[in-house]
Amino acid sequence: QPSVSPGEPSPPSIHPGKSDLIVRVGDEIRLLCTDPGFVKWTFEILDETNENKQNEWITEKAEATNTGKYTCTNKHGLSNSIYVFVRDPAKLFLVDRSLYGKEDNDTLVRCPLTDPEVTNYSLKGCQGKPLPKDLRFIPDPKAGIMIKSVKRAYHRLCLHCSVDQEGKSVLSEKFILKVRPAFKAVPVVSVSKASYLLREGEEFTVTCTIKDVSSSVYSTWKRENSQTKLQEKYNSWHHGDFNYERQATLTISSARVNDSGVFMCYANNTFGSANVTTTLEVVDKGFINIFPMINTTVFVNDGENVDLIVEYEAFPKPEHQQWIYMNRTFTDKWEDYPKSENESNIRYVSELHLTRLKGTEGGTYTFLVSNSDVNAAIAFNVYVNTKPEILTYDRLVNGMLQCVAAGFPEPTIDWYFCPGTEQRCSASVLPVDVQTLNSSGPPFGKLVVQSSIDSSAFKHNGTVECKAYNDVGKTSAYFNFAFKGNNKEQIHPHTLFTP
């Protein structure tokens, strides 16, 4: 017996004292376990287990299915085993046809033998097909045939266990190998929309798509900075052998403002993890925010074009947009379009195209937009810059010379006296009175300026120039004087355009 220390428990003895034993089919299996602390016999083969509390295990008529490992255990938990082969020429293999292999791992084709003395125990392809060239295996009569390092290419491979018996090849039932792919990359995750904007009470539903090589990929929706379990629904598909897709749909049937936040779809496999987020913003009611793309005070030269451009955020979608000038609505000359074609876009652009503006077309141009919840407006003050125009130039009864000019910006009127017939009027004359007229109205049209000088100051023949100018241009009017005796006579005045 094996050497043991005195008093130290030893494993039980099994008779007959062999590690492996062959019994013919139909014969009796008789095994004796000798141990003062005998507890039980256990029989195991494939997934079957039996127990026996008698110290002598007896099977009166052995069958092939009695092939297996018989273990005797004593009260100290020590055990000894014998493996019994029940030789049955009609049933050379015991089979468990379920055959799953994990990629890159070994897997066992479970076809243990009932006769260990047969030869050439191996694997063969079904219907005479050869096995893959790189398929390596190790036969073990008690367990089956171990396929080494399973490849993805072996998926759905049809196999038989095979032995030679009396010179003939005998095949087991067929096995179909199902390969569970190894994860060699993180899952691919995507989300139906990156952001959601909802009003209180509306349903929030977002779908995460998880793609991987097999269904054992783990996925979940999580709320950032929260451990609360979210309600999800799943749909899944196998697109071919190693192309699995799952859709995890997260739904909040009636969203509240405090549901706003970042939601993460997280997936992981044995290789690693991946995630994608979507942002939910829940507002108590809709909104419109308008952003002018140009200054709301616009200066434009007479005859030129200008585009009034706004961007605006509208949620829900805008329903009515209009541009208004002087209580009139534009039916054309404007366009309104979404800033992007993105499904979650809430930003829009509206452009009013004003062409060849006249001086009379300055004023307030208003953009109005509304949705089902709110209205909003923005006004542009448009000033049309015009060259001064001299409206009147007269000698008044009180002896004053008066010049009235209109333009925008407000013109400045200067007076010059030219003695004799000189063309250049350089000597400036200070006005007696300067007034800006019609300043009580909105300052969008032309501004009218009136300037007067006292003609009594002129003692000689000559020309008086009234020059009106602003940033856009200048215009002059002339008064010609001739003295007849003591009388001063105004000759018809005339204007001279100076660009």
């Epitope: 004292g17 492996d20 062959i22 014969d27 009796e28 260990p116």
Partner: antibody, heavy 121, light 107 residues
């Protein structure tokens, strides 16, 4: 050639010791369970004892008549089986055979020619 | 220990005769029984194992039967080379005891 050859027999006085050897060849000795069987002159066969292989944890078993006096051992690296006989008695006089058990049954499918041990004063 | 009782202890027979030797175990040994042939000055030779399985190279005139406690070795047609002593042996529980032997002699 598959064979077993015993050696080490001879004349020994009662109370003496002797070591028998069995040299194996032609098969994988380390896989085999091995036995000693003896036959007294003009008598029948008597099983002496056995040693299991490595798979059987080299367990040894003995006949009651020799237990405590005889020890069976093996050296797989030398393909050799041994029988150490101590406290020899006259009734231990016999031809001692080394025998091989097949892998899957306890019988003796290969025997040596035997070596004679004579215990006499 | 299990006792093995063989009978007869000797028999005389002629070439061509059918010879039967019996062996009885003191308790059930299932099919754990072997038969050996020994000729004078030679080592024993295995004939039958597991009660009825013929050892490779042994002529088919030798056969074994029985299970439990009673076993039989039969030589269907005795040949000159078959004159020898025959032993049964149980291999169920150590010590692996032999029967006393049956000597088959020429009549």
């Amino acid at each position: 050639e598959v064979q077993l050859v015993e050696s080490g027999g001879g004349l020994v006085q009662p109370g003496g010791s002797l070591r028998l050897s069995c040299a194996a060849s032609g098969f994988t000795f380390s896989d085999a369970d091995m036995d000693w069987v003896r036959q007294a002159p003009g008598k029948g066969l008597e099983w002496v004892g056995r040693t299991r292989n490595k798979a059987g944890s080299y367990t040894t078993e003995y006949a009651a008549s020799v237990k405590g006096r005889f020890t069976i051992s093996r050296d797989d690296s030398k393909n050799s089986l041994y029988l150490q006989m101590n406290s020899l008695k006259t009734e231990d006089t016999a031809v001692y055979y080394c025998a091989r058990e097949p892998k899957y049954w306890i019988d003796f499918d290969l025997w040596g020619r035997g070596t004679l041990v004579t215990v006499s004063s | 220990d299990i006792q093995m009782t063989q009978s007869p202890s000797s028999l005389s027979a002629s070439v061509g005769d059918r010879v039967t030797i019996t062996c009885r175990a003191s308790q059930s040994i299932s099919s754990y029984l072997n038969w050996y042939q020994q000729k004078p000055g030679k080592a024993p030779k295995l004939l039958i194992y597991a009660a009825s399985s013929l050892q490779s190279g042994v002529p088919s005139r030798f056969s074994g039967s029985g299970s439990g406690t009673d076993f039989t070795l039969t030589i269907s047609s005795l040949q000159p080379e078959d004159f020898a002593t025959y032993y049964c042996q149980q291999s169920y529980i150590a010590p692996y005891t032999f029967g006393g032997g049956t000597k088959v002699e020429i009549k």
